[in-house]
């Protein structure tokens, strides 16, 4: 059961996992949340009538029934993690806690203009997981400015204290807002031969890799396969860290793979979502349950249901036995990885999907691309919208992209007339046109957000948001396209889509079914060749056949440029403008999305 | 003592090209970051490309993409920048430098080792 709320002067008694200091009991949630063990946990805020060394202290439990007593206790907060519940969570932190010193080890100290500037400087330090930063009004004037910039072994402070005129707070790089470099390579045949800081069992280096990149301390790792010839040291999976960041000795070794950190590029990737079923592969650890199921996917997803399960095992039925049913074997261990891996005995191994929630909705697997023909096929672009107006009459007026639960991105030059979004109606899920009748469900749009420095399509700035009045809950129809991650500035994109239920030519009709087309980006300076009356700036990006045929068109407008990029579909650009359709060297030219991210992420998480 | 030696700088029309070599002695390219900055009279120092030599990850600032390519040869110590279609504002001293942390590749607040840098001007 999802519960939400946290319960004042309340504590939880017993079922202590650790303890941990935070600076608010909401964040002691999210640490609760992220923990692979705490279902519950109890905070202490500051209070006269509480011992000050017990201020902030988060205390992380566990309990085999999901509850555990509760005893009325002042200055006592408490509350249940999210693994219970089915919405979206992030780690993402950027409060900043005024008169709080949270205590790390202080690595860097350097002199700042703000607090914002302390933060980026953490956001972009590959070691820091918060900062504090003594202000102006600092009483010692040696310490006024600085910007200390600290770590911990578990990335939460040692402790917590009152400090007037100081501001604390974390990194933002769980919110994709470093400039870190992403190195997404893997190194076959390859040892990284720095300090172990942890190690765990991983059936391959993908998992290995997004072990480390929600590890706080992980930089990098190396990963040995079953093949390593040490049987002992098979499918160990070694946390790595060094003093710069990077590993300093690679040693060629058959069999062993290494690789870095994602921290820097998290939201264009599944980070804690291990969706992969491994065979022949038994995962050893803590048994919560022996369950009959029909298959292996039938045992995740009773692994997934458990909240206390974290992987699991299922071992096929012998012949007709148990109705054709086979044991499916719901585990956990103390760090949420198997404490041992076996291969050869027959098993399907696999993890519990429930962590999938706290990755975004947007990295998950939606239905292979369908190869050939131009009509679309339901479920194929899951983020795409038609956006109508019903005034005077009902029509779709431009097309746009679920961003989030309850935004959905598109062009401003779409509301050209539009007086309020009153006349507009979201719909989503919808392949034909056709469906749409009388009775047919939409989101009402509560607010238009048009970009302030928006004039005309062909002078950029062409982006706008729409908030919905209700939230969308996500399905295989009807669900989020990533945003590019400002780490991803350099990736070339080269499987990139338009679509739209716009002209299939100039002089046209709005079609029926969702059309898509295949096309190539173009370069900004190849693209301003081919309008020389006009300005394609860096907030633009071009894409288009040399010899035209594919383009998008009128009726296309604010709909998505989707671009496939390690598994994963990223909002490249936005429909925006471009000289006639499908024309000879006149490329599309679209809203560049990756140079508004901090405009969107500032719009969609204002207060 | 780290030396970073740039070369192969020059005068160009404008739409013509050039190499620019950096050759490193007393550190190693392997395994760190390598940039390419540019800095023109009055404007701020800016990121132009990197690479990870490692695995060759490479970065490039928006308003070159397309045009220059940043390469290495671990064997020679040696990171190039080769630069297309060069343009009038592509003018600037170019400096080439040596990070030993992981880095924002463009940023060049977090480069060690700077090279003395060496002039590309590119005419109309």
């Known amino acids: 059961e999802c519960v939400t709320q946290l319960l004042k002067d309340t504590c939880f008694e017993g079922g202590d996992i650790t303890t941990v200091f935070t600076p608010s009991a909401k964040y002691c949630q999210v640490v609760c949340t992220y923990h692979p063990r705490c279902l519950l946990f109890t905070f202490t805020a500051e209070s006269p009538s509480e011992d000050p060394t017990r201020w902030f202290t988060c205390v992380l439990k566990d309990s085999v029934t999901e509850t555990l007593p509760r005893v009325n206790r002042t200055a006592a907060i408490s509350g249940y993690s999210f693994k219970q519940c089915s919405h979206q969570i992030s780690a993402c932190n950027k409060d900043i806690y005024v008169d709080l010193d949270m205590k790390g080890i202080n690595y860097n100290s350097s002199v700042a203009k703000s607090a914002q500037e302390c933060q980026e400087r953490c956001t972009d330090d590959v070691h820091c997981h918060f900062f504090t930063y003594a202000t102006r009004q600092f009483p010692s004037l040696e310490h006024r400015n600085i910007c200390l910039l600290k770590h911990t072994q578990t990335g939460t402070p040692t402790r917590i204290t009152k400090l007037d005129k100081v501001v604390s707070g974390f990194s933002l790089k769980s919110c994709a807002l470093s400039n870190l470099a992403c190195i997404r390579d893997i190194f076959p045949n390859t040892v990284f031969a720095d300090s172990n800081i942890d190690s765990v069992m991983a059936p391959d280096a993908f998992v290995c890799g997004r072990i480390c990149t929600h590890h706080p301390g992980c930089l990098f790792f190396t990963f040995f396969s079953q093949e390593w010839p040490k049987e002992s040291q098979r499918n160990l999976c070694l946390l790595k860290t060094s003093e710069s960041g990077l590993p300093s000795t690679r040693i060629k070794k058959s069999k062993a793979l290494s690789g870095f950190s994602l921290q820097s590029c998290r939201h264009s990737i599944p980070v804690f979502c291990h969706s992969s079923f491994y065979h022949d592969t038994d995962f050893l650890g803590e048994e919560l349950d022996i369950v009959a199921a029909k298959s292996h996917e039938a045992c995740q997803k009773l692994c997934t249901n458990a909240v206390r399960c974290q992987f699991f095992t299922y071992t096929p039925a012998q012949a007709s036995c148990n109705e054709g049913k086979g044991k499916c074997y719901l585990k956990l261990s103390s760090n949420g990885s198997p404490t041992k891996i076996l291969h050869g005995r027959g098993g399907i191994s696999g993890y519990t999907l429930r962590l999938c929630k706290m990755d975004n909705e947007c990295t998950t697997k939606i239905k292979p691309r369908i190869v050939g023909g131009t009509a679309s096929v339901r479920g194929e672009w899951p983020w795409q919208v038609t956006l109508h107006t019903t005034s005077p009459t009902q029509r779709h007026l431009c097309g746009g992209s679920i961003i989030g639960n309850q935004w959905i991105l598109t062009a401003a030059h779409c509301f050209y007339g539009v007086e309020s979004p009153k006349i507009l109606r979201v719909y989503s899920g919808i392949l034909n046109q056709s469906e749409i009748k009388e009775d047919t469900s939409f989101f009402g749009v509560q607010e238009i957000i048009i970009h302030d420095q928006y004039k005309m399509a062909e002078s950029g700035y062409d982006i706008a948001l729409l908030k919905l009045e209700t939230t969308v809950n996500y399905t295989d129809s009807q669900r989020p396209i990533c945003l590019p991650s400002k780490g991803d500035r350099n990736v070339i994109y080269t499987d990139c889509w338009v679509t739209g239920w716009g002209y299939r030519k100039l002089r046209d009709k709005i079609q029926n079914t969702l059309q898509k087309a295949k096309i190539p980006l173009v370069t900004n300076e190849e693209c301003q060749k081919r309008y020389r009356g006009h300005k394609i700036t860096h907030k633009m990006i071009c894409a288009g056949y040399r010899e035209g045929g594919k383009d998008a068109c009128k009726g296309d407008s604010g709909g998505p440029l989707s671009c496939k990029h390690n598994e994963v579909w990223h909002l490249v650009g936005i429909t925006s403008w471009g000289e006639g359709c499908a024309q000879r060297e006149r490329p599309g030219v679209y809203t560049n999305v990756v140079e508004y991210v901090d405009w969107i992420l500032e719009k969609t998480q204002a207060v | 003592q780290v030396q970073l030696q740039e070369s192969g700088g020059g005068s160009v029309q404008a739409g013509g090209s050039l190499r620019l070599s950096c050759v490193a002695s007393?550190?190693?390219?392997?395994?760190?970051?390598v940039g390419w900055f540019r800095q023109a009279p009055g404007k701020e120092r800016e990121g132009v490309a990197a690479?990870?030599?490692?695995?060759?990850?490479?970065y490039y600032a928006d308003s070159v993409k397309g045009r220059f390519t940043i390469s290495q040869d671990n064997a020679k110590n040696t990171v190039y920048l080769q630069m297309d279609s060069l343009k009038p504002e592509d003018t600037a001293t170019y400096y080439c430098?040596?990070?030993?942390?992981?880095?924002?590749?463009?940023?060049?607040?977090?480069?060690?080792?700077w090279g003395q840098g060496t002039q590309v001007t590119v005419s109309s």
């Open positions: 430098a040596g990070a030993i942390t992981w880095v924002p590749p463009l940023s060049h607040r977090r480069y060690t080792y």
């Open positions: 690479i990870y030599s490692l695995g060759g990850s490479t």
């Open positions: 007393g550190y190693t390219f392997n395994n760190n970051f």
